[in-house]
Interface confidence: medium
């Protein structure tokens, strides 16, 4: 709805959910269905985003805010505002141009998205492998023989997994 109009710019007082209709003496007209204006002073309302196909509606469009989409089961969001949906893979796999492929030996992926990452190299920290890695899990590093003095910790957690370069938000 229109508020008291400014003498300088009548459009500045049109609130969210309306547009300043130049064809009608700069009156604040409500946004038509399937359109919105999220800020005041708009000269037009924007068309609502439609969540079709692999996208599904997470939040309906209203007169003041756009619809928000996410992805149907088996897919996950990529990009700002879920601009793309990417196919899920199983743990122990990564998505390639030819579809989901098992992680190569020496790499793992513990998520349904992202890329396979190399197992932690325990020896770089002077540790030994306590539990072997798999396609789905990183190795668990244990103490080196020199660490086996009384009171020493017997297990250190694996290095934190790095986020893949194209991980979703």
């Amino acid at each position: 709805f229109e508020r008291t109009r400014s003498l300088q710019d009548p459009c500045s007082n049109c609130p969210a959910g309306t547009f300043c209709d130049n064809n009608r003496n700069q009156i604040c007209s409500p946004c038509p269905p399937n359109s919105f204006s999220s800020a005041g002073g708009q000269r037009t309302c924007d068309i609502c985003r439609q969540c079709k196909g692999v996208f599904r509606t997470r939040k309906e469009c209203s007169s003041t805010s756009n619809a928000e989409c996410d992805c149907t089961p088996g897919f996950h969001c990529l990009g700002a505002g879920c601009s793309m949906c990417e196919q899920d893979c199983k743990q122990g796999q990564e998505l390639t141009k030819k579809g989901c492929k098992d992680c190569c030996f020496g790499t793992f992926n513990d998520q349904k998205r992202g890329i396979c990452r190399p197992w932690t190299n325990c020896s770089l920290d002077g540790k030994s492998v306590l539990v072997n890695g798999t396609k789905e899990r990183d190795v668990v590093c244990g103490p080196s023989p020199a660490d086996l003095s009384p009171g020493a910790s017997s297990v250190t957690p694996p290095a934190p997994a790095r986020e893949p370069g194209h991980s979703p938000q």
Epitope: F1, P15, G17, S29, S63, T64
Partner: antibody, heavy 116, light 107 residues
Framework: QVQLVQSGSELKKPGASVKVSCKAS????????MHWVRQAPGQGLEWMGW????????TYADDFKGRFVFSLDTSVSTAYLQISSLKAEDTAVYYC?????????WGQGTLVTVSS | DIQMTQSPSTLSASVGDRVTITCKAS??????VAWYQQKSGKAPKLLIY???IRHTGVPSRFSGSGSGTEFTLTISSLQPDDFATYYC?????????FGGGTKVEIK
């Protein structure tokens, strides 16, 4: 589901004040403005004004400037209507209504009776 | 302020009848008109917005039409649940104004 639940009926004496509450649930309170509508006994609907639930800024219809105040407590998703210096002619049912492309959901109404 | 004039003010009809209520605006309000139904002692319910779009859950027997200054609410086959008062409202500009109401009663 969207629900607006208003406070119960009030019986007040002329000159007193009353505060009517409207508790919203089932949606994000600050995404939609809240409007207030009055209906006197046996009469039609009269728009009183609205409040921007994001900024708290109220807008009042000409006939409701002065003694009528809209306010919010966003922490409990509640809008309020306060009427001061009550008069007999304020006797009416007061409704809150969420606004999207129209007043799409309404509270059940609060009857305010002003009588000496 | 924009005046919304509804007619008739009272309408007697029977179950199964086709009912038409009209609303005239004192000036052009584009398609920014809504229709509400109110039963005795209850809050109004939105039926139609933007002149012709049914609100969620509203039965298809309710339809709206018109633009500019003349608007119509039609109930194609009146049901027992439809005996109520109906209001039009322009929401083109502030203040949004309601029509005086049309009471649909049993003949």
């Amino acid at each position: 589901q969207v629900q607006l639940v208003q406070s119960g009926s009030e019986l007040k004496k002329p000159g007193a004040s009353v505060k009517v509450s409207c508790k919203a649930s089932g949606y994000t309170f600050t995404d939609y403005s809240m409007h207030w509508v009055r209906q006197a006994p046996g009469q039609g609907l009269e728009w009183m004004g609205w409040i921007n639930t994001e900024t708290g800024e109220p807008t009042y219809a000409d006939d409701f400037k002065g003694r009528f105040v809209f306010s919010l407590d966003t922490s409990v998703s509640t809008a309020y209507l306060q009427i001061s210096s009550l008069k007999a002619e304020d006797t009416a049912v007061y409704y809150c209504a969420r606004y999207d492309y129209a007043m799409d959901y309404w509270g059940q109404g609060t009857l305010v009776t002003v009588s000496s | 302020d924009i005046q919304m004039t509804q007619s008739p003010s009272t309408l007697s009809a029977s179950v199964g009848d086709r009912v038409t209520i009209t609303c005239k605006a004192s000036q052009d309000v584009s398609s920014a008109v809504a229709w509400y139904q109110q039963k005795s002692g209850k809050a109004p319910k939105l039926l139609i917005y933007w002149a012709s779009i049914r609100h969620t859950g509203v039965p298809s027997r309710f339809s709206g039409s018109g633009s500019g200054t003349e608007f119509t609410l039609t109930i194609s086959s009146l049901q027992p649940d439809d005996f109520a008062t109906y209001y039009c409202q322009q929401r083109y500009t502030t203040p949004p104004t309601f029509g005086g109401g049309t009471k649909v009663e049993i003949k």
